[in-house]
Interface confidence: low
């Protein structure tokens, strides 16, 4: 449905508040270093222009595409060249190349200061003084640090952020009310950002077909009573939504996501019995709720898969006539029967099935050739099952912190070239799989664990892509989206790695460690552990444990000392010497 003015169309569909918020998110995700005030000014100019187009769709420039309008606006920023360097070259290009150029310059790890949370009273005063600016600042700060954050979902986070301040700033104990809510929003926000980053990587690096396959599997698990045609329609619409958001088309994305939620709720009888509560909520909550809805119950008496996909004489005929549709049906049928499998496992099975048909449908006796295809699935299913069992046992034995440390050592030995902050961040997140998933019964463990690990390993992949240092990481990240985790699991110690020179400065600590939160102190210790492994990759678990225990005791002792700084200086030298001796450095 063509509109004379795309900007007027979206302004009317979304309303002024959402329009302004989404344009701010879009601009902050593109120009991540620009000051808040500059972005607000640009957003206000775009909004005023949009209003003129709403009044008269034939007005000058109202017929231009959103990319043209937004790109032209971004290219008016005076300091573009000095702040962003070669990104300024994007402005010499025409659409659609200009937008593609901006997208390529999005930075997953921008050089921005850590967000420090002010005192509760300071935040409440700021909230009361100017609520609108306070909430815009939240959108801006999150968007620039997470340039692929799912924009309509960020509106939902902002709504919850506002609700937290509205409630808690008038509570008797503001801090007790507000801080847990902010912690929860922060943790959920990081998880949401990472999940969306995987969707965008899937689309951008592996293509629409890869994303659609993921969506077929996930939606079939979630809506096992829905017909294949219904799931296909949802997959097509969902793919459009995420393609738009990952491509920076945030207004279209938010609009289409709202349409999809509306469709799902109007057709919930043919989709899922679990949607009723979600569909009673307001728009932002509704969309979020649908995205997180639990799996519906599987229909009773589903027939065996073998009949249609192995025993039928028409397998090759059906495959040849419409390959992706036939494979989609296979994936749908398998996934709806297996909510206990991870999506990536289901995709591996579908890939194995596809490869088998490619080979067998060209053979002299196709049926004979593919008759045992389901037997090939057994080792693929058992591998993640065994891995999860072993790691959950290790997690239960060690607890989260020490489990993270075990993973830190494991991954540093696999890919020691990767930067220490990245290894610490990724291994800490890998370690969280224990508390997140090991508590679940067997039937829920694999989808929880392996699909979560896919999200975390994608963080490693996107951070590594920015500054590639390891061929092994590149290989695991680029060869196959669904085999990333097995690829990393299969990596052994990198025998080609030349140990890092010993640098005492790396292991010098000061009294400031004593005032850090428990989490930040853990990160300091884990950073030291990674550096130790980089110096001595052949160190045994026992050696590393002894050094880390000594280190923990050293920190505890010096933090209790009267003259902390002197203690850290003197005892630190002794610790370094003892560690060198223990590790044979």
């Amino acid at each position: 449905d063509a509109h004379k003015s795309e900007v007027a169309h979206r302004f009317k569909d979304l309303g002024e508040e959402n329009f302004k918020a989404l344009v701010l998110i879009a601009f902050a995700q593109y120009l991540q270093q620009c000051p808040f005030e500059d972005h607000v000014k640009l957003v206000n100019e775009v909004t005023e222009f949009a209003k003129t187009c709403v009044a008269d769709e034939s007005a000058e420039n109202c017929d231009k595409s959103l990319h043209t309008l937004f790109g032209d606006k971004l290219c008016t920023v005076a300091t573009l060249r000095e702040t962003y360097g070669e990104m300024a070259d994007c402005c010499a290009k025409q659409e659609p190349e200009r937008n593609e150029c901006f997208l390529q310059h999005k930075d997953d790890n921008p050089n921005l200061p850590r967000l420090v949370r002010p005192e509760v009273d300071v935040m409440c005063t700021a909230f009361h003084d100017n609520e609108e600016t306070f909430l815009k600042k939240y959108l801006y700060e999150i968007a620039r640090r997470h340039p692929y954050f799912y924009a309509p979902e960020l509106l939902f986070f902002a709504k919850r952020y506002k609700a937290a301040f509205t409630e808690c700033c008038q509570a008797a104990d503001k801090a007790a009310c507000l801080l847990p809510k902010l912690d929860e929003l922060r943790d959920e926000g990081k998880a949401s950002s990472a999940k969306q980053r995987l969707k965008c990587a899937s689309l951008q690096k592996f293509g629409e077909r890869a994303f659609k396959a993921w969506a077929v599997a996930r939606l079939s698990q979630r809506f096992p009573k829905a017909e294949f045609a219904e799931v296909s329609k949802l997959v097509t619409d969902l793919t459009k939504v995420h393609t738009e958001c990952c491509h920076g088309d945030l207004l279209e994305c938010a609009d289409d996501r709202a349409d999809l939620a509306k469709y799902i709720c109007e057709n919930q009888d043919s989709i899922s019995s679990k949607l009723k509560e979600c569909c009673e909520k307001p728009l932002l909550e509704k969309s979020h709720c649908i995205a997180e809805v639990e799996n519906d119950e599987m229909p009773a008496d589903l027939p065996s898969l073998a009949a249609d996909f192995v025993e039928s004489k028409d397998v090759c005929k059906n495959y040849a006539e419409a390959k992706d549709v036939f494979l989609g049906m296979f994936l749908y049928e398998y996934a709806r029967r297996h909510p206990d499998y991870s999506v990536v496992l289901l995709l591996r099975l579908a890939k194995t099935y596809e490869t088998t048909l490619e080979k067998c449908c060209a053979a002299a006796d196709p049926h004979e050739c593919y008759a045992k295809v389901f037997d090939e699935f057994k080792p693929l299913v058992e591998e993640p099952q065994n891995l999860i069992k072993q790691n959950c046992e290790l997690f239960e034995q060690l607890g989260e912190y020490k489990f993270q440390n075990a993973l830190l050592v494991r991954y540093t030995k696999k890919v020691p070239q990767v930067s220490t902050p990245t290894l610490v961040e990724v291994s800490r997140n890998l370690g969280k799989v224990g508390s997140k998933c090991c508590k679940h019964p067997e039937a829920k463990r694999m989808p929880c664990a392996e699909d979560y690990l896919s999200v975390v390993l994608n963080q490693l992949c996107v951070l590594h892509e920015k500054t590639p240092v390891s061929d092994r990481v590149t290989k695991c990240c680029t060869e196959s989206l669904v085999n990333r985790r097995p690829c990393f699991s299969a990596l052994e110690v990198d025998e080609t790695y030349v140990p890092k020179e010993f640098n005492a400065e790396t292991f010098t600590f000061h009294a400031d460690i004593c005032t850090l939160s428990e989490k930040e102190r853990q990160i300091k210790k884990q950073t030291a552990l990674v550096e130790l492994v980089k110096h001595k990759p052949k160190a045994t678990k026992e050696q590393l444990k002894a050094v880390m225990d000594d280190f923990a005791a050293f920190v505890e002792k010096c933090c209790k000392a009267d003259d902390k700084e002197t203690c850290f200086a003197e005892e630190g030298k002794k610790l370094v010497a003892a560690s060198q001796a223990a590790l044979g450095l």
């Epitope: 951008q204 690096k205 592996f206 293509g207 629409e208 077909r209 890869a210 390959k323 992706d324 490869t355 490619e358 080979k359 060209a362 590149t474 290989k475 680029t478 060869e479």
Partner: nanobody, 123 residues
Framework: QVQLQESGGGLVQPGGSLRLSCAAS????????IAWFRQAPGKDLEEVSC????????NYADSVKGRFTISRDNAKNTVYLQMNSLKPEETAVYYC????????????????WGQGTQVTVSS
């Protein structure tokens, strides 16, 4: 309509080199594995080389290993086949073909084809 367009063919002496290009119009090659096939007069279609959509996987026919190199430049929406030490028996029409994401086992699995470019190796 999606189109692939080969270029870079021509007449070359034995032992010489050519670089073939396969460019796409109306769609982005980012999501497609691209293969090069060749067909000599009176012979069957033969797969020469293929590169996956990410560029992470490449394969070559045994007869061209070490002499031919396939590469891609997604920014230019183009895939290249660098052919060195060409032999007279490699005279053929060279075609590029596209399939979603990954290289396929046989020619009928490729969704889009170019018109072909003639390569003649002769002194």
């Amino acid at each position: 309509q999606v189109q692939l367009q080969e270029s870079g063919g021509g007449l070359v002496q034995p032992g010489g080199s050519l670089r073939l290009s396969c460019a796409a119009s109306r769609f982005t090659l980012d999501y497609y594995a691209i293969a090069w096939f060749r067909q000599a007069p009176g012979k069957d279609l033969e797969e020469v080389s293929c590169i996956s959509s990410s560029g992470g996987a490449t394969n070559y026919a045994d007869s061209v290993k070490g002499r031919f190199t396939i590469s891609r430049d997604n920014a230019k929406n183009t895939v290249y086949l660098q052919m060195n030490s060409l032999k007279p028996e490699e005279t053929a029409v060279y075609y590029c073909a596209a399939a979603t994401l990954e290289c396929r086992g046989r020619s009928s699995s490729y969704d889009y084809w170019g018109q072909g470019t003639q390569v003649t190796v002769s002194s």
